[in-house]
Interface confidence: low
């Protein structure tokens, strides 16, 4: 006769591991006992449970309530256990004897797989700002036995680099995801994807980018100067920028105070009438935590009766 | 068998710290997760964070970040969790929990926590 | 956070009822969803894994099943024992949230 065992058990950290030992026999023999030993190389052979024909299951103290004979129905030669609720330190090299009667003893050794599937973990680096060179964005760490595989799923250009830390009986690898940060990447989604054999699909952990910028400042309204002239409603200057954090903006007249009457609203500059006193160069100040820009204008309201003199002077002239 | 035994009931006044301890037993305390659940009276379940006492990594729910620690003592199997600047929306009971790996199979019987001036 | 919404709040059911208690995630959480029991003044106990892998000591008329973001808990047979508040757990993403929970009393 001959033992049938597997090579290698493989069982996800807590599930039961099915340990198989069956005897292949002629007809007429029959198994004794069976005994199952932890049998890892410079560890005495460690005795898990006996199985014997007559007295049934014997689990040695160290084993209490976690070895059991599979479910019935049961085949007398079958000496299989049930390890209940692995864990990592069960990972080793175990030993099924089988003794029969009229044909001995026989052995057959298995290594037991417990894989620990991995919680992983994703830390954003450093606050982005557009301008830094390469930087890092996240790091995403997991440990698991064995190695897990961690990669990045996302639509952003950037570069990868990973690094492993052995311990006895499992490893952590983390993978830093390294970037130069843009504007256009803000809102964009970093997903770090872990892969592992004790997962029933793979993990995935996302972080949304934010890159600090600000824009070039401008001032629209002046595009058509014929229209600041004096006695004009309704003037307003608005000043244009974007930026991450949102920018806060800030009025003032470079050439004295703001004359009275104009009203300062966020982004807008809103004039009452307009009179040549308006006229004068304005700055528009747009600042956020990152950084702060300033753009100037010169308005020069229009009296139409100093224009006609003008252009009387000038008809004359000609 | 698997056993999860914390200490007993604390009342702490506004602004005060509480460190809760969760004794493991009956398993390898290095190869399992240990989690922090709350829950307040009458209400659900919340997740406050987890220890890995293996390479003592942590996780924690950023509703609690800064203000809470979870750490662990290989030596003598026990996870802790301290939760500083209590206020009275703090008052539960709060539970250890072991994850497996990622579902919690054996609690700890609960720490009541009550804060009050 | 991934929102896990349980329903009913309530429910009310004979001895020897079929039961069915529903959780709905905000979004895909694959099978990572566990069953937890509580009765008054303990501490959850763990009922279903993985969505339908019951967990040890577990009766079976307790089942589990779903993927996605649909789950439920079915009791096959309610028996007098089973009084308890029940909850749902996402474990797909942290932080790892759990249903309002559905308290299940004899009629």
């Known amino acids: 006769g001959e033992l049938e065992t597997s090579d290698v058990v493989t069982v996800v950290l807590g599930q039961d591991a099915k340990l198989p030992c069956f005897y292949r026999g002629d007809s007429g023999e029959q198994v004794g006992q069976v005994a199952w030993a932890r049998a890892d190389a410079g560890e005495g052979a460690q005795e898990l449970a006996l199985l014997h024909s007559k007295y049934g299951l014997h689990v040695s103290p160290a084993y209490e309530g976690r070895v059991e004979q599979p479910p019935p129905p049961r085949n007398p030669l079958d000496g299989s256990v049930l390890l209940r609720n692995a864990v990592q330190a069960d990972e080793g090299e175990y030993e099924c004897r089988v003794s029969t009667f009229p044909a001995g003893s026989f052995q057959a050794r298995l290594r037991l797989r417990v894989l620990v599937p991995p919680l992983p973990s994703l830390n954003p680096g450093p606050a982005l700002e557009e301008g830094q060179g390469l930087t890092l964005a996240a790091s995403c760490t997991a440990e698991g036995s064995p190695a897990p595989s961690v990669t990045w799923d996302t639509e952003v250009k950037g570069t990868t680099s990973s690094r492993s830390f052995k311990h006895s009986r499992s490893a952590a690898v983390t993978s830093e995801f390294h970037l130069v940060p843009s504007r256009s990447m803000n809102g964009q989604p970093l997903t770090c994807v872990v892969s592992h054999p004790g997962l029933l699909q793979d993990q995935r952990i996302t972080h949304i980018l934010h890159v600090s910028f600000l824009a070039e400042a401008s001032v629209r309204g002046l595009e058509d100067q014929n229209l600041w002239h004096v006695g004009r409603e309704g003037a307003m200057l608005k000043c244009l920028s974007e930026g991450q954090p949102p920018p806060s903006y800030n009025w003032t007249r470079l050439d004295g105070p703001l004359p009275s009457g104009v009203r300062v609203d966020g982004d807008t500059l809103g004039f009452p009438p307009l009179t040549t006193e308006h006229s004068g160069i304005y700055v528009c100040h747009v600042s956020n935590e990152f950084s702060s820009r300033d753009s100037q204008v010169t308005v020069d309201v229009l009296d139409p009766q100093e224009d006609s003199g003008k252009q009387v002077d000038l008809v004359s002239a000609s | 068998q698997v056993q999860l035994v914390q200490s007993g009931s604390e009342l702490k006044k506004p602004g005060a710290s509480v460190k809760v301890s969760c004794k493991a037993s009956g398993y390898t305390f290095t190869s399992y997760y240990i989690h922090w659940v709350r829950q307040a009276p009458g209400q659900g379940l919340e997740w406050i964070g987890w220890?890995?006492?293996?390479?003592?990594?942590?996780k924690y729910n950023e509703r609690f970040k800064g203000r809470v620690t979870i750490t662990a003592d290989k030596s003598t199997n026990t996870a802790y969790m301290e939760l500083s600047s209590l206020r009275s929306e703090d008052t539960a009971v709060y539970y250890c929990?072991?994850?497996?790996?990622?579902?919690?199979?054996?609690w700890g019987q609960g720490t009541s926590v009550t804060v009050s001036s | 956070d991934i929102q896990m919404t349980q329903s009913p709040s309530t429910l009310s059911a004979s001895v020897g009822d079929r039961v069915t208690i529903t959780c709905r995630a905000s979004?895909?959480?694959?099978?990572?969803v566990a069953w937890y029991q509580q009765k008054p003044g303990k501490a959850p106990k763990l009922l279903m894994y993985y969505a339908s892998n019951r967990f040890t000591g577990v009766p079976d008329r307790f089942s589990g099943s779903g993927y996605g973001t649909d789950f439920t808990l079915t009791i096959s047979s309610l028996q007098a024992e089973d009084v308890a508040v029940y909850f749902c757990q996402q474990a797909y993403r942290s932080p790892y949230t759990f249903g309002q929970g559905t308290k299940l009393e004899i009629k």
């Open positions: 929990a072991r994850s497996n790996p990622y579902v919690m199979d054996y």
């Open positions: 979004q895909s959480v694959n099978n990572d």
């Open positions: 220890i890995y006492p293996g390479n003592v990594n942590t």
